[in-house]
């Protein structure tokens, strides 16, 4: 069937970066500026995505592939193919409808995006807290209290929070 189709359909010979031009006797024409075709045999070229406003161009459009956007500094991508840009917050905060808010006690966020998460429950794994959590950092779990030698202190104060911490992805 494929062979028959290629014999009957001249469009199947048009490579990526071209389209099968009905107005010109079905010859393969290059995609016009600001358009692309990523597969062969296409009858039209797709319009290139434009990265405007809070979006910035990560990869320019070519005749065979669409442009790719990311976000300007202070924002991060959300959704497939970076369909949205969301405001960054500081470590130790999360974005709410009212803007960036500090993490509640017992929760942390070590990134500039995402939500405040509860500190890890070390006892879930039979471990103890080795380093206390902060708004910016999770606890670090250590050995179970039974594993500690007598007189050894089990909890270390948290390491001082520093930028940049976990960078936004």
């Amino acid at each position: 069937f494929e062979r028959t189709r290629s014999l009957q359909d001249p469009c199947s010979n048009c490579p990526a970066g071209t389209f099968c031009d009905n107005n010109r006797n079905q010859i393969c024409s290059p995609c016009p500026p600001n358009s692309f075709s990523s597969a062969g045999g296409q009858r039209t070229c797709d319009i290139c995505r434009q990265c405007k406003g809070v979006f910035r161009t990560r990869k320019e459009c070519s005749s065979t592939s669409n442009a790719e956007c990311d976000c300007t500094p202070g924002f991060h991508c959300l959704g497939a193919g970076c369909s949205m840009c969301e405001q960054d917050c500081k470590q130790g905060q999360e974005l709410t409808k009212k803007g960036c808010k500090d993490c509640c006690f017992g929760t942390f966020n070590d990134q500039k995006r995402g939500i405040c998460r509860p500190w890890t429950n070390c006892s879930l794994d039979g471990k103890s807290v080795l380093v206390n959590g902060t708004k910016e950092r999770d606890v670090v779990c250590g050995p179970s209290p039974a594993d500690l030698s007598p007189g050894a202190s089990s909890v270390t104060p948290p390491a001082p929070a520093r930028e940049p911490g976990h960078s936004p992805q």
Epitope: I115, G142, A159, S167
Partner: antibody, heavy 119, light 107 residues
Framework: QVQLVQSGAEVKKPGASVKVSCKAS????????INWVKQAPGQGLEWIGN????????NYNQKFKDKATITADKSTSTAYMELSSLRSEDTAVYYC????????????WGQGTTVTVSS | DIQMTQSPSSLSASVGDRVTITCRPS??????LNWYQQKPDKTVKLLIY???RLRSGVPSRFSGSGSGTDFTFTISSLQPEDIATYFC?????????FGQGTKLEIK
């Protein structure tokens, strides 16, 4: 005991995709980060990304953002990593790992899955 | 990304020797430094986490020290079963990054 068991070796053609699985047992799957790490032949280790299975929140190494997609199925305690548009440089052993209790270290490693890309 | 400079890339030592490997991150990572052992069969094991904390079940001949941008991993008395490649890894900042590894051989 805590265990991560990965799917078997794969041989794929350039341009194809592959989905590697990592089945967790011996702990509460939703409470720990699962990471994926790449080791190309004769090379060091590279962190690809991770997922928190409870809400499927992911982080990616920018280098692998267009290559890897990490997902998790809570019902089967299994994490997955799909690699797309495979090229010869994707030939490597891929490991899944679990954190030690907080994301900052990786205490349990799967046995590794070899992915070979060859025409 | 934080670069992890690990040295030496390989070393040969005798059973009973004291072996030292260093790891230098390109920026301050506080104490978020871990050490892993990869055996010739490719199995990987966490030995030390948070710079100096020995993972439960790991022999006490393994130790770690340092902070900020200078870290050291030591095997106090090398054993035949310690033949492996050792990696440092920073857990301070995404993306997590590893040193290039130190291949340890017995003389």
């Amino acid at each position: 005991q805590v265990q991560l068991v990965q799917s078997g070796a794969e041989v794929k053609k350039p341009g194809a995709s592959v989905k590697v699985s990592c089945k967790a047992s011996g702990y509460t799957f939703t409470s720990y980060w699962i990471n994926w790490v790449k080791q190309a032949p004769g090379q060091g280790l590279e962190w690809i990304g991770n997922i928190y299975p409870s809400d499927s929140y992911t982080n990616y190494n920018q280098k692998f953002k267009d290559k890897a997609t990490i997902t998790a199925d809570k019902s089967t305690s299994t994490a997955y990593m799909e690699l797309s548009s495979l090229r010869s440089e994707d030939t490597a052993v891929y490991y899944c790992t679990r954190d030690y209790g907080s994301a900052y270290s990786m205490s349990t490693w799967g046995q590794g899955t070899t992915v070979t890309v060859s025409s | 990304d934080i670069q992890m400079t690990q040295s030496p890339s390989s070393l040969s030592a005798s059973v009973g020797d004291r072996v030292t490997i260093t790891c230098r991150p390109s920026q301050d990572i506080s104490n978020y430094l871990n050490w892993y052992q990869q055996k010739p069969d490719k199995t990987v094991k966490l030995l030390i986490y948070y710079t100096s904390r020995l993972r439960s079940g790991v022999p006490s001949r393994f130790s770690g020290s340092g902070s900020g941008t200078d870290f050291t991993f030591t095997i106090s008395s090398l054993q035949p079963e310690d033949i492996a490649t050792y990696f440092c890894q920073q857990g301070d900042t995404l993306p997590y990054t590893f040193g290039q590894g130190t291949k340890l051989e017995i003389k």
